[in-house]
């Protein structure tokens, strides 16, 4: 498919307060949370608000014509291109207080297509050829999704759909929240 594209608009996907299982401490009115209630984090952990805009999964709206050989769509179609960063994990829905985000490195999330939509377009062809009907698959929305170690190389490159990740059979270490629970919650969030 050929591209004749120009950017129209951009939508940022930034986790809203309602998406968090626990609000960041400085957004919490009640400052008396204890460690147990706060997932082991100190009450005044420094969440920098500037991180939110630095790490946003953006939906860029592009308008393009669909082409098939010499034929071109009568009207342009508008679709989304997913762009931007999805870290750090503490800004992702359901990550706060559940993932082991105190570690120096952790789950890598990417801004990838979430939903697609099918759109039927009419292609006009030169030389008096009859118009053709084509169905195109367009990105409808974007989201942050974790790269898992069960992605293959090609999926990693285009950030394909996530495989369900079976848990490895290791004995859990004693923690306030088990490693398995953390992992399941993080992945089910997406």
């Amino acid at each position: 498919q050929g591209w004749q594209a120009f950017k129209n608009d951009a939508t940022e996907i930034i986790p809203e307060l309602g998406e968090y299982p626990e609000p960041p401490p400085e957004l919490e009115n009640n400052k008396t949370m204890n460690r147990a209630e706060n997932g082991g984090r100190p009450p005044h952990h420094p969440f920098e608000t500037k991180d939110v805009s630095e790490y946003s999964c953006r939906e860029l709206h592009f308008t393009r014509y669909v082409t098939d050989g010499p034929c071109r769509s009568a009207k342009p179609v508008t679709e989304l291109v997913c762009s931007g960063q999805c870290g750090p994990a503490r800004l992702l829905p359901n990550a706060i207080g559940r993932g082991k985000w105190w570690r120096p490195s952790g789950p890598d999330f990417r801004c990838i297509p979430d939903r697609y939509r099918a759109q039927r377009v009419q292609l006009l062809c030169p030389g008096g050829e009859a118009p053709r009907a084509r169905k195109v698959r367009l990105v409808a929305s974007c989201k942050c999704k974790r790269l898992t170690r069960f992605h293959n190389q090609s999926e990693l490159k285009d950030f394909g759909t996530e495989a369900a990740r079976p848990q490895k059979g290791r004995k859990p270490r004693p923690r306030a929240r088990s490693a398995k629970a953390n992992q399941a919650e993080l992945e089910n969030a997406y």
Epitope: G87, A89, D108, L147, R149
Partner: antibody, heavy 119, light 110 residues
Framework: EVQLVESGGGLVQPGRSLRLSCAAS????????LHWVRQAPGKGLEWVSG????????DYADSVKGRFTISRDNSKNSLYLQMNSLRVEDTALYYC????????????WGQGTTVTVSS | QSVLTQPPSASGTPGQRVTISCSGS????????VNWYQQLPGTAPKLLIY???QRPSGVPDRFSGSKSGTSASLAISGLQSEDEADYYC???????????FGGGTKLTVL
């Protein structure tokens, strides 16, 4: 100034114990997860252990599991590493390091304390 | 032998662009964020890049990180003599359940 200062290193015989300490200053201690990273002479970096904001959030490298214990005392702004059953291969420069950014690397480091295990 | 593989050495002349690679597996770089550290001779390591490509404040924009699949790389443009140091990549490994470092790359500025 953000500072981590390690102490407690020294020469010790195999099988003996040693306790390392790391004193923090210049930042809110409770805001940081803390780690021990070691570097054997002429070698690369090796992560030893890490502790989150409470004692339930702890990880160890397999090479030290069951022998080393990491702990922190937020009231004293201090991190500790209790090293038991020391081996010759534990000889290294031990760094205390911290991070306060989720999954954001170790952004604060001490200068290290040397542990030599030799008979 | 390190879980993450780096070339033992790299070199370049002042002003040049140098890239250091870091190869891992699906259980570390393939699924977790990558950090890079710089260790100048006789000093403690310093965080250079976090979360694959983010620079902490104070790190010049000559340093940049990237990641693709199970490999990561650190690029240094406009090489300067003070960049001569050891560089380490690191990532959490889900199978080993520990923070793994690469073996380090000694960068020499000719």
């Amino acid at each position: 100034e953000v500072q981590l200062v390690e102490s407690g290193g020294g020469l010790v015989q195999p099988g003996r114990s040693l306790r390392l300490s790391c004193a923090a200053s210049g930042f809110t201690f409770e805001d940081y997860a803390l780690h021990w990273v070691r570097q054997a002479p002429g070698k690369g970096l090796e992560w030893v252990s890490g502790i989150g904001w409470n004692d339930d959030e702890i990880d160890y490298a397999d090479s030290v599991k069951g022998r080393f214990t990491i702990s922190r005392d937020n009231s004293k702004n201090s991190l500790y590493l209790q090293m038991n059953s020391l081996r010759v291969e534990d000889t290294a420069l031990y760094y205390c390091a911290g991070n306060n950014r989720g999954y954001g690397g170790l952004d604060v480091w001490g200068q290290g304390t040397t542990v030599t295990v030799s008979s | 032998q390190s879980v993450l593989t780096q070339p033992p050495s790299a070199s370049g002349t002042p002003g040049q662009r140098v890239t250091i690679s870091c190869s891992g597996s699906s259980s570390n770089i393939g699924s977790n964020t990558v950090n890079w550290y710089q260790q100048l001779p006789g000093t403690a390591p310093k965080l250079l890049i976090y979360s694959n490509n983010q620079r902490p404040s104070g790190v010049p924009d000559r340093f940049s990180g990237s990641k693709s699949g199970t490999s990561a790389s650190l690029a240094i443009s406009g090489l300067q003599s003070e960049d001569e140091a050891d560089y380490y990549c690191a990532a959490w490994d889900d199978e080993l359940e520990l923070y793994v470092f690469g073996g380090g790359t000694k960068l020499t500025v000719l």
